[in-house]
């Protein structure tokens, strides 16, 4: 969470941004809020990126002005125009690229004053893992797969029954480069699993952490997955 202040004569406005992460190839949002101003035509929003000449996006007089927009953002950005009057200056970003990572500035000017705040935008790839029983194996085993990760994550297994056990010697993890030559598919196989136990496959890099759980009993298989972004907020 970054809060910036600006001074315009005696007036300053608070601008707030949140560090966030973008998933390569998906659409993302760079969050920014400011003190609302009902005079829409008096609001100017400028998004800038450190090291880039030109603007990422500009919104003024109630509409976009992309005349100064840098080429790398062409056709990829939009503000939530109907939410600007209530203080939302967040930026939608289409088809997030690795090169979109960096420090952004959300600059606001209204009839009340002006202000700005920086935002650190991380980019990578992260996806939910899916665990299945691998019936092809000679012994009972579990296969954990996640289609898109970058940078290369670490993979670890855990079990409810054998808490604290190290499964590195009874598991095998591979990383397969996807067709776009950036992200990778993660596959990890855990061998010699026992029935009536809950196993967890944990995949983590510096952007996200994902966990897949599987409980195998005589009568059923229960699965659960979750993903959380790290250092956001």
């Amino acid at each position: 969470l970054i809060i910036g202040f600006g001074i315009s004569g005696k007036h300053f406005i608070t601008v707030t941004t949140f560090t966030s992460a973008g998933n390569i190839g998906e659409d993302g949002t760079l969050s920014c809020t400011f003190e609302p101003d009902i005079k829409l035509n008096g609001i100017v929003i400028q998004w800038l990126k450190e090291g880039i000449k030109g603007l990422v996006h500009e919104f003024k007089e109630g509409k976009d002005d992309l005349s100064q927009q840098h080429e790398m953002f062409r056709g990829r950005t939009a503000v939530f125009a109907d939410q600007v009057v209530v203080g939302n200056a967040s930026l939608r970003l289409k088809n997030v690229q690795l090169t979109d990572a960096g420090t952004y500035t959300c600059y606001i000017r209204t009839s009340k004053g002006k202000g700005n705040a920086n935002l650190e935008y991380k980019t990578g790839a992260f996806s939910m893992p899916e665990i299945n029983v691998d019936y092809n194996a000679s012994s009972e085993s579990l296969r954990c797969e996640a289609p898109r990760w970058f940078p290369q994550p670490t993979v670890a297994w855990a079990s409810q029954v054998d808490q604290g056990a190290n499964f590195s010697e009874v598991s095998n993890t591979s990383f397969e480069l996807n067709s776009e030559n950036v992200t990778m598919k993660v596959v990890s196989v855990l061998y010699n699993v026992t029935i009536n136990n809950t196993y967890s496959c944990m995949i983590e890099n510096d952007i996200a952490k994902a966990t897949g759980d599987i409980k195998v009993t005589d009568s059923e298989v229960k699965r659960r997955s979750q993903l959380q972004l790290l250092n956001s907020g």
Partner: antibody, heavy 120, light 107 residues
Framework: QLQLQESGPGLVKPSETLSLTCTVS??????????WGWIRQPPGKGLEWIGN???????YYNPSLRSRVTISVDTSKNQFSLKLSSVTAADTAVYYC????????????WGQGTLVTVSS | EIVMTQSPATLSVSPGERATLSCRAS??????LAWYQQKPGQAPRLLIY???TRATGIPARFSGSGSGTEFTLTISSLQSEDFAVYYC?????????FGGGTKVEIK
């Protein structure tokens, strides 16, 4: 409501330059949230995006046509234009102009289209 | 470039029936997809953008769904004016590309 109208010669000789103009009425070409694009459709075939322009003059072209395409804008006349050089019979198509959202980038509305035939 | 593939090429449907058109992208386009309707001798008309948002003035019988690489346009109850060619278009990355079209004809 916004309307677009293509104009230009319907017949162009091989190796010459195809020139079309799109006139925008019912709204300003300087509207900030839009690009202005060209799309073509050979007879009985599908649609191909040619490129777009912003009112400030910045352009983006389809790489398959980039070496032959020029799109320009005249804000005083509320018009934008397409030039396609060194044409061949394969460039025979109905050429459409359209307003293109800055993002989302859908095309709406479209001009009614003009058929350009490349033949000697 | 991203290749868009539509199926079937031709769909024969009786008036009042449901029509389901498919569009597949060669790689993920997230929800950055639009659908257009084109009648003979006319320009295409925008129906859907953002994969599922109906354009202004488009009847509720038209609906879009899907994300990533698989998309569907559904016409819940075909009217006589709906017989036309339908195109999908991705705007996820340049160059923007269209599918080859699906012709919906009267059965």
């Amino acid at each position: 409501q916004l309307q677009l109208q293509e104009s230009g010669p319907g017949l162009v000789k091989p190796s010459e330059t195809l020139s079309l103009t799109c006139t925008v009425s019912g709204g300003s070409i300087k509207s900030g949230s839009y690009y202005w694009g060209w799309i073509r459709q050979p007879p009985g075939k599908g649609l191909e995006w040619i490129g777009n322009i912003y009112y400030s003059g910045s352009t983006y072209y389809n790489p398959s046509l980039r070496s032959r395409v020029t799109i320009s804008v005249d804000t005083s006349k509320n018009q934008f234009s397409l030039k396609l050089s060194s044409v061949t019979a394969a460039d025979t198509a109905v050429y459409y102009c359209a307003r293109e959202g800055s993002y989302p980038n859908q095309f709406d509305p479209w001009g009614q289209g003009t058929l350009v035939t490349v033949s000697s | 470039e991203i290749v868009m593939t539509q199926s079937p090429a031709t769909l024969s449907v009786s008036p009042g029936e449901r029509a389901t058109l498919s569009c597949r992208a060669s790689q993920s386009v997230s929800s950055n997809l639009a659908w257009y309707q084109q009648k003979p001798g006319q320009a295409p008309r925008l129906l859907i953008y953002g994969a599922s948002t109906r354009a202004t003035g488009i009847p509720a019988r038209f609906s879009g769904s899907g994300s990533g690489t698989e998309f569907t346009l559904t016409i819940s109850s075909l009217q006589s004016e709906d017989f036309a060619v339908y195109y999908c278009q991705q705007y996820h990355s340049f160059p923007f590309t269209f599918g080859g079209g699906t012709k919906v004809e009267i059965k």
